[in-house]
Amino acid sequence: EDELQVIQPEKSVSVAAGESATLRCAMTSLIPVGPIMWFRGAGAGRELIYNQKEGHFPRVTTVSELTKRNNLDFSISISNITPADAGTYYCVKFRKGSPDDVEFKSGAGTELSVRAKPSAPVVSGPAVRATPEHTVSFTCESHGFSPRDITLKWFKNGNELSDFQTNVDPAGDSVSYSIHSTARVVLTRGDVHSQVICEIAHITLQGDPLRGTANLSEAIRVPPTLEVTQQPMRAENQANVTCQVSNFYPRGLQLTWLENGNVSRTETASTLIENKDGTYNWMSWLLVNTCAHRDDVVLTCQVEHDGQQAVSKSYALEIS
Amino acid sequence: EDELQVIQPEKSVSVAAGESATLRCAMTSLIPVGPIMWFRGAGAGRELIYNQKEGHFPRVTTVSELTKRNNLDFSISISNITPADAGTYYCVKFRKGSPDDVEFKSGAGTELSVRAKPSAPVVSGPAVRATPEHTVSFTCESHGFSPRDITLKWFKNGNELSDFQTNVDPAGDSVSYSIHSTARVVLTRGDVHSQVICEIAHITLQGDPLRGTANLSEAIRVPPTLEVTQQPMRAENQANVTCQVSNFYPRGLQLTWLENGNVSRTETASTLIENKDGTYNWMSWLLVNTCAHRDDVVLTCQVEHDGQQAVSKSYALEIS
């Protein structure tokens, strides 16, 4: 009769984390008598995964009844697979011997690779706001995935970005991997409503990528433009001067009126008008009693926005 | 030697659509000589799935080498499973005979059930807007799932709804199923920012339910409240009357001022103030030259909102 062969039909098996892995093994003969064992790895440091006759292997079940007469199927199933279970598994036939059983023949091995999903990408932006035309950095991180192959893309409002750098760690073999990417985004005045998206594609996601987002509203400061104008008034002894504060973000704004350099009134903006692009407008007016002035008056609208240095605009009111 | 038995160790196997199904079968003896075949179903109408010796079965692979001497493992793997593959599969041993091989013994059968994910739920709302305190209906649909057991829940802003009716079709056995649910939602004035969510849980989703959403902003109309007031004016010959249009949604609004029933001015609201609840406010003012009037004037602020019938508020301006 032909000498026994140990057949491991699959060279490799890929399993999703949390699932069970079936490792198949068949013998071509019932002879010689002796137990079957499964190991991970080869050589002196190999790890025993299953011993047919003794030991405790709660995660392992046999696919068929090993003690059944004429059974030649020694396939096993390992439950609740994690990335740490990856490796090459060998089905090994032993021949009974004294004092110890003797290894008789090993299968060619089945490489178990574990597919583990990446964690939800976390996108974080800059610690301080920047103004339009400046560049800010966003980072995206995801962990715990396997295999190592992964694709990361950045988008701003659906448009793919190209200025980014991505690392997958560790560089060598590992049970699972992490990805870290930094994208550089140039801010524009219209970016209050903009979003950056980090999109991760991985074999475990079955074509349904994971996305992490960040709002540019957290990263941008749009400084206001000021315009001071005089409104027509039908009453002769009064002048109505308005300060139009336009297209600023975020909300926080304090306005001070000065008459010839002296503080006349200070206001904190509350009810703002929101523009379509997410910036705000606000208008303040000053009624000036022209009877109280002999000479021309310089009216100054001074605005402090989001804790930044104040900006101002002046208007010379002619007293005729 | 004992008479040959055909062992199908699994009574049932459940596989996700797109994956491969392994159907296990082992013989307890090499005798009698004859081929093995796999069928779906029993009786005269059974479907041949695999014939060891002849025919073309591109989706079927054998788990071990069937021609190997002493092989007793006749397990097969069927690739790219779809819901249409569900059924009971029998491993059948034939004995060589003349003119035809004769069925010798059948395994007990393995029921293959196919797990197919439901499609992303699509939520649709009413065709026309309704006002607060009225009830509107939302529908949610999802298709193509298997098995039939599925759970659908409705939420409004995270609060579970109870007034809904759900059907799963068809009622009898099918390769896949569809779900249709209609929820009745009572609108409130604060619902512009509200969302209804249809949440579907199914065994294939591994505890990560699918969600479909609809915004109540598409379904609601919040009619405005009007308030007409006179503002103090320092100029004696002028009166400033304002019409405060509050808490309306959606944006579309046209305002007409009438003086003693005659149209004075018509405006279309553009720059609106958005409230926290998503409704809008707008203010219009009318400067009235009191010198031009001898008698008291009735000023009417008339508002047409979102194509609905106009509402109005009047103010009697006393000419002293």
Epitope: E47, I49, E54, G55, P99 | -
Partner: antibody, heavy 113, light 108 residues
Framework: EVQLVQSGAEVKKPGATVKISCKVS????????MHWVQQAPGKGLEWIGR????????KYAPKFQGRVTITADTSTNTAYMELSSLRSEDTAVYYC??????WGQGTLVTVSS | EIVLTQSPATLSLSPGERATLSCSAS???????LYWYQQKPGQAPKLWIY???NLASGIPARFSGSGSGTDYTLTISSLEPEDFAVYYC?????????FGQGTKLEIK
């Protein structure tokens, strides 16, 4: 449920032979090696030997070789351990165990003249 | 024959303290074949840790096992009253199988 039930306590004279049984339920004895372990009063555990009930193959510790015989009856799902030429230092609790994971309750053997 | 030597023979500690039990082998043992058992007076030993570091079913997470080659350790991070017992290490890497002499963990 896996259970290993051993026979009751024995008192023997020096030179005699004792045979302890271990009846198992919840599994087929042929599927696993059956081990026997000795524990003298106040002392540690000592491995005696094991049997493969499928083919009756045995392994023994050198200390017990020649005096111990382990057998199994697959029809009754029972393993046996026989120790001959008893001496006072054989006074101990004897345990059977299934594949190193599940243990019987122990059988006390007292050797005394 | 592989001789397993456990240290200390007796360990006196109070509940809440950390316990470290050692098991040293006279020649290398594959980590797959190193087991730990707990035994309380009048009871049969119970499998506690298998394959060096895996907790048997129902064993609390305060227990852990580690080691390789000739040196193995059982650690209890914070002792509970029910942990006081005798612990044995056991190798089944080669015949004859052997046990350590045991470490008695007693209440201080």
């Amino acid at each position: 449920e896996v259970q290993l039930v051993q026979s009751g306590a024995e008192v023997k004279k020096p030179g005699a032979t004792v045979k302890i049984s271990c009846k198992v339920s919840g599994f087929n004895i042929k599927d696993y090696y059956m081990h026997w372990v000795q524990q003298a009063p106040g002392k540690g555990l000592e491995w005696i030997g094991r049997i493969d009930p499928e083919d009756a193959e045995t392994k023994y510790a050198p200390k017990f070789q020649g005096r111990v015989t382990i057998t199994a009856d697959t029809s009754t799902n029972t393993a046996y351990m026989e120790l001959s030429s008893l001496r006072s230092e054989d006074t101990a609790v004897y345990y059977c165990d299934r594949g190193l994971a599940y243990w019987g309750q122990g059988t006390l053997v007292t050797v005394s003249s | 024959e592989i001789v397993l030597t456990q240290s200390p023979a007796t360990l006196s500690l109070s509940p809440g303290e950390r316990a470290t039990l050692s098991c040293s082998a006279s020649s290398s043992v594959s980590s797959s074949y190193l087991y730990w058992y707990q035994q309380k007076p009048g009871q049969a030993p119970k499998l506690w840790i298998y394959s060096t570091s895996n907790l048997a079913s129902g064993i609390p997470a305060r227990f852990s096992g580690s080691g390789s080659g000739t040196d193995y350790t059982l650690t209890i991070s914070s002792l509970e009253p029910e942990d006081f017992a005798v612990y044995y290490c056991h190798q089944w890497s080669s015949y004859p199988y052997t046990f350590g002499q045991g470490t008695k963990l007693e209440i201080k």
